[in-house]
């Protein structure tokens, strides 16, 4: 077996127990079979190798671990627990590894874990205690600062009989363990709504990505507590209008940049306040690109170019005159 490379380039390890000539356990800092390791970069890459389990003999020096493009299916409790622990592991990327089940305590015993990417896994079963590690009402704080959960929605036929949004939010809020989270990415998850309590309990957020979902309204969502929020991505949703309460909250955030492109804005009388706000605010990035989708007569009109005379509502007919 070849020892781990100490150069900054990656060294592919030979399968270190393949020959069985030596029946000794592998050295603690040896590179696992099917992985590439750089001790200088403190990085291990086990990428696109169809692994069905997390390698057991990860080198203790690992700071950045890439396990992308595998077939892990399930992360059990203590999936990364080792003796001695992986005390340096700070960034863990598990994207695209066919995970559909992440159990309670899957990331326990990783005291330095700051970045976790579970994107592009069909997470039909994400335990409420996946990130908190215990079912206590208040857990030990997680060290996580960045949590990337883009495109984790399973196919329709694999979803359980429960709200996918609710399952994800339960994992985010359990035990208040993620109070230190600064970046949360939830893009491309078919979210229809954002549970109202989720943002209030993540007070440290700087970056929130909810792009490419199916959010229709933000009426019940409060951004008031997110005083550190710097970017809010709401592109490619199903937003029709932002109401006064939301506009005021966004305007009150001192560092915020909001991204609203590619939403089907309804340019009727309910849009007047938002148009007025858009003309005055500096928080919306690319606001000159926002266009109406409805009604038909307003399609492709630029929101910033509208005036109050353009924004009318059809009179509501009495029930006796409405057609079915």
């Amino acid at each position: 077996s070849s020892p781990t490379s100490s150069a900054s380039s990656f060294s592919s390890s030979a399968p270190f127990l393949a020959s069985a000539v030596s029946a000794q356990p592998p050295l603690p800092d040896q590179c696992p079979a099917l992985c590439e390791c750089s001790e200088a970069a403190r990085t291990v890459k086990c990428v696109n190798r169809n692994l069905t389990e997390v390698p057991t003999d990860l080198p203790a020096y690992v700071r950045n671990l890439f396990l992308t493009g595998n077939q892990l299916a399930v992360l059990p409790a203590g999936a990364f627990a080792r003796r001695p622990p992986l005390a340096e592991l700070a960034a863990l990327n598990l994207s695209g590894s066919r995970l559909d089940e992440v159990r309670a305590g899957a990331f326990e015993h990783l005291p330095s874990l700051r970045q976790l990417d579970l994107s592009h896994n069909p997470l039909a079963d994400l335990s409420p205690f996946a990130f908190s590690g215990s079912n206590a009402s208040v857990s030990a704080p997680s060290p996580l600062v960045e949590l990337i959960l883009n495109h984790i929605v399973p196919p329709e036929d694999e979803r359980q009989n429960r709200s996918f949004e609710g399952m994800v939010v339960a994992a985010l809020l359990a035990g208040r363990a993620l109070q230190g989270l600064r970046r949360l990415e939830l893009a491309s998850n078919h979210f229809l709504y954002l549970p109202r309590d989720v943002l209030a309990q993540l007070p440290s957020l700087r970056h929130l990505d909810l792009s490419n979902n199916s959010l229709v309204s933000l009426t019940y969502v409060s951004f008031r507590n997110l005083t550190h929020l710097e970017s809010l991505h709401l592109e490619d949703n199903a937003l029709k209008v932002l109401h006064n309460g939301t506009l005021a909250e966004l305007q009150g955030l001192p560092h915020i940049r909001v991204f609203l492109d590619n939403n089907p804005w309804v340019c009727d009388c309910h849009m007047a306040d938002m148009v007025t706000w858009l003309k005055e605010t500096e928080v919306v990035q690319g606001k000159d690109r926002l266009t109406c989708a409805y009604p038909e007569k307003m399609r492709n009109r630029v929101l910033l170019e509208l005036n109050s005379a353009d924004l009318d509502c059809d009179p509501i007919l009495p029930p006796s005159l409405q057609t079915s």
Partner: antibody, heavy 120, light 111 residues
Amino acid sequence: EVQLVESGGGLVQPGGSLRLSCAASGFTFSNFGMHWVRQAPGKGLEWVSYISSGSTSFYYADTVKGRFTISRDNAKNSLYLQMNSLRDEDTAVYYCSRTNSLLRGFFDAWGQGTTVTVSS
Amino acid sequence: DIVLTQSPDSLAVSLGERATINCRASQSVSSSSYTYLHWYQQKPGQPPKLLIKSASNLESGVPDRFSGSGSGTDFTLTISSLQAEDVAVYYCQHSWEIPLTFGQGTKLEIK
């Protein structure tokens, strides 16, 4: 046809060593995780050890941890179990078995077994 | 460790009659994605043979008189119409976590 053939069993004194082998044929060996399972005379089945398809993961029962080492050679379609510091209670028929993964898998093919007897 | 307890320890059933074997786990071995419980048959002098995977999925080539059911902690193996060749010891096994464990076995005989 999937075939697993164990060898290397025999009589050994307590404290001694043995190396079991399992020769695989009839399937793509390098695509499958492999287990050792044992059965003491007149007793039930006991899982011993697992190795993943590419030798990245190794697991052992507490009863053998530190004494047994599992390994494989995909080029030779072979699985091994190095058994050191053998005890009377290691006496059993040892089976090798195939699986598609550790937790989401099951023992879907078995060898006929090789008998290990530890006795003074 | 998860303990699997089979009942009964032994069972005598007439040919053509139904045989039922139970397996109880000391904790749940099911998630909403998968059930980590499997059944095996071992005839005298032979290695075990997989019958049922993930609680209820019949292994290819196994006669359809065998069926499995259950989730969580309680599971059942049923032979709808006992045949002479079904005399064997039957084991349940979980793959929820390490260590993998088996039930103690149920010996099935002809009455």
